[in-house]
Amino acid sequence: QPPPPPPDATCHQVRSFFQRLQPGLKWVPETPVPGSDLQVCLPKGPTCCSRKMEEKYQLTARLNMEQLLQSASMELKFLIIQNAAVFQEAFEIVVRHAKNYTNAMFKNNYPSLTPQAFEFVGEFFTDVSLYILGSDINVDDMVNELFDSLFPVIYTQLMNPGLPDSALDINECLRGARRDLKVFGNFPKLIMTQVSKSLQVTRIFLQALNLGIEVINTTDHLKFSKDCGRMLTRMWYCSYCQGLMMVKPCGGYCNVVMQGCMAGVVEIDKYWREYILSLEELVNGMYRIYDMENVLLGLFSTIHDSIQYVQKNAGKLTTTIGKLCAHSQQRQYRSAYYPEDLFIDKKVLKVAHVEHEETLSSRRRELIQKLKSFISFYSALPGYICSHSPVAENDTLCWNGQELVERYSQKAARNGMKNQFNLHELKMKGPEPVVSQIIDKLKHINQLLRTMSMPKGRVLDKNLDEEGFESGDCGDDEDECIGGSGDGMIKVKNQLRFLAELAYDLDVDDAPGNSQQATPKDNEISTFHNLGNVHSPLK
């Protein structure tokens, strides 16, 4: 049947609408024309569109589509950007507090080792930060560096305090002896295992969040093809050429067009789903030695235990080192005797239990739950965009790309479109190069996440040491234990809190001059309050 004639024989309505898109009326015919030069809005009769108008409609359609896509992903994008920033900052805070705890332990228990110990501790935790942020540092090297640096100071200040400055060349011999004689027992190896496992997981977690941002940014800024532009123009604007200003596209037709336009983007869906599920698995495994908060905040205790180990073996060590490094010393010095009790820090860090206090762990789980609500984001995009652009409800009295119809029929619409361009062909082109690249990156991160994810129910690694130290299982209750053995063990209720700034901040720069007691001890630290409230509206 022929289309109804334009209600406005003068194209007046079309002119006034088009003027909003493009000031000036030189492109709009005053009365309907044959439109033989049109390539998209192919007329079945007189038309109020010109070739130039059609080009402008195509440009506008593509811009509209880009804006719709950006608004579709806005909530998801904000969720990931916000959390990536919050977690990165939280991890930095954990590192800073871990450094402060360790410095405080030295200041309280081994004042003669400061300020050198502060310097080595500071360097170690700087390396930890760099590693988390993606620098290529070997964790074993970091830990070896810390103990290599500490031992000469421990030996010359604690075990052999009579050594004069002229014997400083013994330091190199002591560095070598540290490894050869395993003077710290298996503590360095224990720390290497715990630190490398927890930091690896932390680093991949941050990398995954940053890749999530990159994925959204990539699809957010996709430039749609000319074919897609034509389809969108036909759907949104060709009705205007017939003077049908108030007619909306059929919903089913919109879905067909969107699936054609977004065929490449929808290919991300499979890898996006896998990304969220793999990230969930990783997060579920981030506890005990796979939780950097747990490991780093307990390091001061393990380091303390390692120094005690050296002191317990001081007599034997001094004799051996005396022989081994004799050429480096001008004379033999008597090893100072220290009663063992002096060096055992009986204090245990107590963190008051506060109901509903947010932990890093709970924050991670909350993020995963929110992300899971976006698991179908890419497959649902065509439908989402149609539901957020004007479409006719129930597919009645709507525009099918060629004419006003009483009821939309997908088959009829497809047949009608065949001579104009092939929807199937559009789908077969494959994704844009940028989409292919992001799919490759998703595949890579998914592989990494799968590699890192732990088997369910796995606990702290056993058999860490050949010398009888077990990193140990802390039982099945809700307490988690950190650190090495004996008095150094810290118990923290319901995991360590999502950290806010502590009351004190003992940095390497100001620590030597700081006179106040700065060891984490009973009642000194009340509670670590909720960082999430400060940083995030995502509650």
């Epitope: 360097e123 700087t126 390396d127 930060s129 760099l130 942020l133 993606g134 620098s135 290529d136 540092i137 070997n138 074993d140 090297d141 970091m142 070896n144 560096e145 290599d148 190199e172 011999c173 560095r175 070598g176 490894r179």
Partner: antibody, heavy 121, light 110 residues
């Protein structure tokens, strides 16, 4: 006496390879990161490559990445630089340097005397 | 990686002071990465003068001092002596842990 002694330099044609060695003594070699730094005639210092104490991490300047390989043998207290696909612009005195630290670059507290590499046809 | 920026030359009479600047970016000097300074005589290997922005290795005279603020670092030589005539290089590293040197400053004692 802490010492570093480079060897292996000489005249080589463009496209060819050369291997530099650096023998270390007087310090615990396996505890420190090590570097190669070069200086073209009349020019400033240019960092070439670094390796961590265990050899677990290596780092390269963009200008040599893919062509040069740094390695170490802690049992022999020796640092190496394998230079492939040499170019005229690689002509320089190559210094071996010890880092203050073990895990990565910081400051170079001991330097060798350098070995001259000339790339010319 | 881009080099740090140093003035090509600086000069002063014996007893005077000379300050050499070294400007980097937010990804090297301006980050948490420390700056080191080296002295080099013609035909000789460089020698470490300052590390961690302001620390002097043993044997380096206290006439040499270092400082850092923001993306810039400085080396100050007070009470200039004839033997201070040499090339001076600053050095730092970036977040990829790749080392960056300054272009060098030639100090002339007049």
């Amino acid at each position: 006496q802490v010492q570093l002694q480079e060897s292996g330099g000489g005249l080589v044609q463009p496209g060819r390879s050369l291997r530099l060695s650096c023998a270390a003594s007087g310090f615990t070699f396996s505890s420190y990161a090590m570097h190669w730094v070069r200086q073209a005639p009349g020019k400033g210092l240019e960092w070439v490559s670094a390796i961590s104490s265990s050899g677990g991490s290596t780092y390269y300047a963009d200008s040599v990445k893919g062509r040069f390989t740094i390695s170490r043998d802690n049992s022999k207290n020796t640092l190496y630089l394998q230079m492939n696909s040499l170019r005229a612009e690689d002509t320089a005195v190559y210094y071996c340097a010890k880092d203050r630290r073990g895990s990565h670059a910081d400051a170079f507290d001991v330097w060798g005397q350098g070995t001259l590499v000339t790339v010319s046809s | 990686q881009s080099a740090l920026t140093q003035p090509p030359s600086a000069s002063g009479s014996p007893g005077q002071s000379v300050t050499i600047s070294c400007t980097g970016t937010s990804s090297d000097v301006g980050h948490k990465f420390p700056v080191s300074w080296y002295q080099q005589y013609p035909g000789k290997a460089p020698k470490l003068l300052i590390y961690k922005n302001l620390l002097r290795p043993s044997g380096v005279p206290d006439r040499f001092s270092g400082s850092k603020s923001g993306t810039s670092a400085s080396l100050a030589i007070t009470g200039l002596q004839a033997e201070d005539g040499a090339d001076y290089y600053c050095q730092s590293y970036d977040s990829s842990l790749r080392v960056v040197f300054g272009g060098g400053t030639k100090v002339t004692v007049l």
